[in-house]
Interface confidence: medium
């Protein structure tokens, strides 16, 4: 069970990292900035 939980959270972490990498590639420094609106 613990393996399953670890795998699930690691998979989530990998997805988050992939999204961050994508955002950094598309947005550069903007990704860390305040000029962002909904």
């Amino acid at each position: 069970h613990s393996d399953g939980i670890f795998t699930d959270s690691y998979s989530r972490y990998r997805k988050q990292m992939a999204v961050k990498k994508y955002l950094a590639a598309v947005l550069g420094k903007r990704y860390k900035q305040r000029v962002k609106n909904k």
Epitope: V19, L23, V26, L27, G28, K29, R30, Y31, K32, Q33, R34, V35, K36, N37, K38
Partner: antibody, heavy 126, light 114 residues
């Protein structure tokens, strides 16, 4: 699709002036409308931007804070109010659009301008 | 804040020739760079964004290249209509909390066509 500025004039030092930017064929929608100026024979100087979506967030160059105010007055009009004008404010004032980058539901500034108006000349002289 | 420095003006070449305009950033801006063309009495016109992406309707004679801190705008097969001042602009935003990314223009480079 075009932008057109108006309101430029010859004014005395210390005066106030409001410039207007009117869009035709472009509805302001989740982009950034900005003002950029150019003193005679000089380069480009950014003044301010406003997000045209519901937040209406405004952004100013550090030197422009307090003396310049950018506003969205309708779905196709943005204004720039200028106070305490000096000779150093003599320039052509351009209205320009930053079309924004949409990512995951957020609109980030693109930090470049794809549409410009022809400009309006402001001369400050006694 | 990022400071953009351009080739001193003017740069000149004959009709049919090639000119290169250099733009240097004071820090790494990856490929976040735009180029504008401005003719006397007219507003700037966006030519290129993201270092090399040509805007719609812009001639393929204009080519942007570079990355990091060094960028080049090359205009080939020069025409009289290319006589103008060219500005680069960092479009990476600002790492400073007290400024924004819109103000990082180069000083401009005038191109004279002989």
């Amino acid at each position: 699709q075009s932008l057109e500025e108006s309101g430029g004039d010859l004014v005395k030092p210390g005066a106030s002036l409001t410039l207007t930017c009117k869009a035709s064929g472009i509805a302001f929608s989740n982009d950034y409308m900005c003002w950029v100026r150019q003193a005679p024979g000089k380069g480009l100087e950014w003044i301010a931007c406003i997000f045209t979506g519901s937040s209406g967030s405004t952004y100013y160059a550090s030197w422009a804070k307090g003396r310049f105010t950018i506003s969205k007055t309708s779905s196709t009009t943005v204004t720039l109010q200028m106070t305490s004008l000096t000779a150093a404010d003599t320039a052509t004032y351009f209205c320009a659009r930053d079309r924004a980058i949409s990512v995951l539901g957020y609109f980030y500034a693109a930090y470049f301008f794809d549409f410009w108006g022809p400009g309006t000349l402001v001369t400050v002289s006694s | 804040d990022v400071v953009m420095t351009q080739t001193p003006s003017p740069v000149s070449a004959a009709v049919g020739g090639t000119v290169t305009i250099n733009c240097r950033a004071s820090e790494d801006i990856e490929s976040f760079l735009a180029w504008y063309q401005q003719k006397p009495g007219q507003p700037p016109k966006l030519l290129i964004s993201r270092t090399s992406t040509l805007e719609s309707g812009v001639s393929s004679r204009f080519k942007g290249s570079g990355s990091g801190t060094e960028f080049i705008l090359t205009i080939s097969d020069l025409e009289c209509a290319d006589a103008a001042t060219y500005y680069c602009q960092c479009t990476d935003g600002s790492s400073s909390s007290s400024s924004y990314g819109w103000d990082a223009f180069g000083g401009g480079t005038e191109v004279v066509v002989k």
